[in-house]
Structures are given as C-alpha cells and as structure tokens.
C-alpha cells in the first residue's frame, strides 16, 4: 500500500463533569499516533498520553492543580508506519483545543439525595456532598469544598398524590421544608451555580419518595 499523510486532529472537545476532565478528538488514527500537551496561559506545555492510538486523554490530574486557571491543550499527530508527515521542516502537525476553565465550565454531576427525615410537619432533606478529584493537603475535596457558596441546590418536592411541584433553595447541602402531616412527598434536587453563563445546572437527581428506604419518620 502507498504512503498516506498524517492528519491533524480535529473536533477537539473538553468533556468534564465534577472536574473529571477528558479531552476528546477525531479522527481514529491510521498509521499515526497522538501525543497531547496541556498548558496554562502562562505555563509550559506538558506532554501527556504519549504516542497513543486513543482519541481521548484524561487530563484530570493536570486541571485539578488549579481549577480556576484557564487551560489550553493541543494534540500532535505523529507518523507511525507507512506515512509522510505533512508538517513543515519535520515539525509534527498539531491542533489546539478551545480554552477551558474548569471552575467555570465543568458540568455539575447529577446529585443524589442522601437522606430525608420527617419530624412532625418538617422534613430535612440532605444532598450527598460528592467527592471530586480536586486535592488539598492530600485529601480529596467535595463539590461544596470547591465551589463554596457559589453552589446552590434547588429542591423540587410534591405530594405523591398530586403533580403540583414546589421548590426550595439552599446554599448548604440541606433543606428544611414544611409538609402536610399524613401526606407522602417525593423529592428531586438539582445543583446550580447561578453566577455561571454556561453549564449552570446539573441534571435532576433520581426521585426519592417518602415511604421508601431513605426516609426516617418521627412524630
């Protein structure tokens, strides 16, 4: 078979949820491999995912060093086999990613209702504080640790017997709501960062209803 040209990567896309961050690109390689480099605006280019035939590279370890920095990645195409490099003067082809600022852009993962507890006409609903891969002093920080008061949760709740939803908001991970005595309620929560312009909201949590396992009831 004849020689082919190396092809530059394209459609470089950041996929990030709760700071777990993967760069994806196309095309599937034929007679070429890729190496990814990542940098902050002021930093040096660091090579990752050396000589890979994958079309994705996990860059979480790099971006969690400072989630408020803006990062740029680039994907190099290296000939591997019966190919000709189309870069000039022996320089390999590369393509730049869009800029990515984890703090502003990582998707908020689907939250989980950890528990709810009814005491009379009050219900305390607790949202699980999900662990991220962001580290401080050798421990992993939770979503709340990272975002602080920038992160709020919206609670949707309704009587099992009707469809009319009410909402409540909290900038902690707990809600205390009033309910009608003797009624069963269902709950769903959503994570929100109101100050954001993109990726402001998570998907809704799975619905949890009173009378099921997660609840505690006290008169």
């Amino acid at each position: 078979s004849g020689t082919t040209n190396t092809v530059a990567a394209y459609n470089l896309t950041w996929k990030s949820t709760n700071f777990k961050t993967i760069l994806e690109w196309e095309p599937k390689p034929v007679n070429q491999v890729y190496t990814v480099q990542i940098s902050t605006k002021s930093g040096d280019w660091k090579s990752k995912c050396f000589y890979t035939t994958d079309t994705e590279c996990d860059l979480t370890d790099e971006i969690v060093k400072d989630v408020k920095q803006t990062y740029l990645a680039r994907v190099f195409s290296y000939p591997a086999g019966n190919v000709e490099s189309t870069g000039s003067a022996g320089e390999p082809l590369y393509e730049n990613s869009p800029e990515f600022t984890p703090y502003l852009e990582t998707n908020l993962g689907q939250p989980t209702i950890q528990s709810f507890e009814q005491v009379g006409t009050k219900v305390n609903v607790t949202v699980e504080d999900e662990r991220t891969l962001v580290r401080r002093n050798n421990t992993f920080l939770s979503l709340r640790d990272v975002f602080g008061k920038d992160l709020i949760y919206t609670l949707y709740y309704w009587k099992s017997s009707s469809s009319g939803k009410k909402t409540a908001k909290t900038n902690t991970n707990e809600f205390l709501i009033d309910v009608d005595k003797g009624e069963n309620y269902c709950f769903s929560v959503q994570a929100v960062i109101p100050s954001r312009t993109v990726n402001r909201k998570s998907t809704d949590s799975p619905v949890e209803c009173m009378g099921q396992e997660k609840g505690e009831f006290r008169e």
Epitope: T35, S47, F50, T53, K65, Y78, A80, G90
Partner: antibody, heavy 117, light 106 residues
Framework: QVQLVQSGSELKKPGASVKVSCKAS????????MNWVRQAPGQGLEWIGM????????RLNQKFKDRAVLSVDKSVSTAYLQICSLKAEDTAVYYC??????????WGQGTTVTVSS | EIVLTQSPATLSLSPGERATLSCSAS?????MNWYQQKPGQSPRIWIY???NLASGVPARFSGSGSGTDFTLTISSLEPEDFAVYYC?????????FGGGTKVEIK
C-alpha cells in the same frame, strides 16, 4: 545547543545507595520530560522511568518502584536518579535522555556505576 | 509489560550486503523506534515511528512493520553501519527495549 552532562563514575558496595546527576543546558529544563535508561555490561538498554521537572510528576518502571527515586533541582537545571539497596546486578551505565519526538535526540554521556564488595 | 525480542542476536555480513533486523513484540505496538549504538557511545535515535529516518540517517536504512512484527533493513551495508541496533516501543508503559542486534563485519 542542548547538552546533558552527567556526574562521574561511582564505585559502591552492595546495600549502599547512589545518586547520579544530569545537568541540562541549552533549553528550558522544566518543559521536557527526562528519561533515565541503564545498560548493564554487554547487555541491552532498560528504561527506568522519567520525570517532568516543572511539577516532578514521575513515571517509573514498576521493576524499580521500590528502589529508584527520580528528582530534580530546577534552580540548577539538574535531574537526579537515586538507587538504594544496590546489588551487583545494578552495575551498569546509567543514561539520562530528554524525551523528544522524532529526530530530536539528546542523551547524557552516561555514568558508570559499579557495585562490588 | 511488552517484551521485545530481537533476532538475530548477531548478524555477520560484509560491506555491500543487505541486512535485515527483526523485532518481535509480545503484544501489539503502534509506536516503535530504533536506536544505533557504537562502542563507548550513547545510543542515537535512528528510526522513529516505525519507518521515519532520523535526521542524518542515510536512505539505505528503512523501517517497516505493524502490530507485533517490525523490521529494520539496510539495503547495502557501509563500514560505518556496523554497530548494535535496539528497537524500543513507546506504546505502553513501561517503555521497553529489545535485547539488541549486533551487526558485525564478516
């Protein structure tokens, strides 16, 4: 021009430690991964691992994970390989080599480490 | 780890002859380099990415292969080609080298 200059030969007793240095010049030291490779007398090459000087991230061959430590001193653009609990089988020439794509190829001159009682 | 087996261990040939050096991998490799080493010298990159000649390497050298079988070919040996050649895979960590093929004058 790019240069990697390694420390001189070492004679060590079994059980001792050795620290080999590799001083880089002619390029931005912190921006390139640095490999360490060894070659026992009359034998082939063996990749020990590599380190990224800017943040000291290390990739180590599992064979060496308990006995080899890679480090850098950015202030003097120098990479280090330390091997502890030396055995006769560790007698080899140790090379540092900048990680590069393609034709770029920069190796130190090699450091001979002899382990003998 | 990926084990690279080079054959033959020694190749005894005369100048002008064709040399074929093989490197067999224990599992599939997508990125293979070849190094040349002469006595008392550090290794030098010779072929990278399976088939790309490093700068200054004469056109009588070529590299080929895919998957688990790779070849370095010297079409017509010159006196300066007599040396040891090592293959190296960079497809998965730990990066590994073959045991080398010594090309010696017959």
């Amino acid at each position: 021009q790019v240069q990697l200059v390694q420390s001189g030969s070492e004679l060590k007793k079994p059980g001792a430690s050795v620290k080999v240095s590799c001083k880089a010049s002619g390029y931005s030291f912190i921006s390139y991964w640095m490999n360490w490779v060894r070659q026992a007398p009359g034998q082939g090459l063996e990749w020990i691992g590599m380190i990224y000087p800017a943040d000291s991230e290390t990739r180590l061959n599992q064979k060496f994970k308990d006995r080899a430590v890679l480090s850098v001193d950015k202030s003097v653009s120098t990479a280090y390989l330390q091997i502890c609990s030396l055995k006769a089988e560790d007698t080899a020439v140790y090379y540092c080599a900048r990680e590069d794509y393609g034709s770029s190829d920069y190796w130190g001159q090699g450091t001979t480490v002899t382990v003998s009682s | 780890e990926i084990v690279l087996t080079q054959s033959p261990a020694t190749l005894s040939l005369s100048p002008g002859e064709r040399a074929t050096l093989s490197c067999s991998a224990s599992s599939s490799v997508s990125y293979m380099n070849w190094y040349q080493q002469k006595p008392g010298q550090s290794p030098r990159i010779w072929i990278y990415g399976i088939s790309n000649l490093a700068s200054g390497v004469p056109a009588r050298f070529s590299g080929s292969g895919s998957g688990t079988d790779f070849t370095l070919t010297i079409s017509s040996l010159e006196p300066e080609d007599f040396a040891v050649y090592y293959c190296q895979q960079k497809s998965s960590f730990p990066w590994t080298f073959g045991g080398g093929t010594k090309v010696e004058i017959k």
